[in-house]
Interface confidence: medium
């Protein structure tokens, strides 16, 4: 559906609401809700980030 349409999502889509802001919106992502600690490596570290860390926002 076109942006702003009220058509329901396609069948089988996850029941979690889509929290992405509308196109062009300046609303920031939902910060502070991640359950992961700050997993960015220490400065100067060559270690890779921890496995599967997708919920910790990297704001660098």
């Amino acid at each position: 559906p076109a942006p702003g349409s009220t058509a329901p999502p396609a069948h089988g889509v996850t029941s979690a609401p889509d929290t992405r802001p509308a196109p062009g919106s300046t609303a920031p992502p939902a910060h502070g809700v991640t359950s992961a600690p700050d997993t960015r490596p220490a400065p100067g570290s060559t270690a890779p980030p921890a496995h599967g860390v997708t919920s910790a926002p990297d704001t660098r």
């Epitope: 920031p28 910060h31 600690p37 700050d38 997993t39 220490a42 980030p49 496995h51 599967g52 660098r60």
Partner: antibody, heavy 117, light 110 residues
Framework: QVQLQESGGGLVQPGGSMKLSCVAS????????MNWVRQSPEKGLEWVAE??????????HYAESVKGRFTISRDDSKSSVYLQMNNLRAEDTGIYYC????????WGQGTTVTVSS | DIVVTQESALTTSPGETVTLTCRSS?????????ANWVQEKPDHLFTGLIG???NRAPGVPARFSGSLIGDKAALTITGAQTEDEAIYFC?????????FGGGTKLTVLG
Amino acid sequence: QVQLQESGGGLVQPGGSMKLSCVASGFTFSNYWMNWVRQSPEKGLEWVAEIRLKSNNYATHYAESVKGRFTISRDDSKSSVYLQMNNLRAEDTGIYYCTGVGQFAYWGQGTTVTVSS
Amino acid sequence: DIVVTQESALTTSPGETVTLTCRSSTGAVTTSNYANWVQEKPDHLFTGLIGGTNNRAPGVPARFSGSLIGDKAALTITGAQTEDEAIYFCALWYSNHWVFGGGTKLTVLG
């Protein structure tokens, strides 16, 4: 060279208040979540509080034992993190450390808090 | 309350490989617990060794490595040195708070 320097500890009576400070250098402080951890002979190491980034609206989390009594805050312009401690109890006695970065890479030397009458 | 359990004491010899473990009372430790390992030397000198289960902090010798072994987090020192004698703490993340273990006193007989 990364450094974390705590200050503000001392002797306080039960029910009293105290504010600890930690100044960081050697890394981009504003990019990293910071924690306070305390150590006592009775409880060993105990995580106290965490503060996230400006982009996280400076979200905070606390250990159950200090919720409602302690407040963590930060001033990125001063590369500093603080711990305001109110209604102190004898069991809050210990050495308090600020620590952080991926996730406890760096530690200060600690500042001692003694709660006693 | 969640309890994180470590061996109270271990003894090794220089050049040997020793593994310290960290168990959670909630069940298996996973990468979502972001296991950390911290070393304490005399006079309350703390140094972070491992973050996020297996990431070495800057300047930490390669002989220190973090992993998951079975249902526990583990710190392995491959080729222990006398200067590795210290107390080692693990910390586990539980959604919005950390819990530290009681520490393992490692003795390196020289």
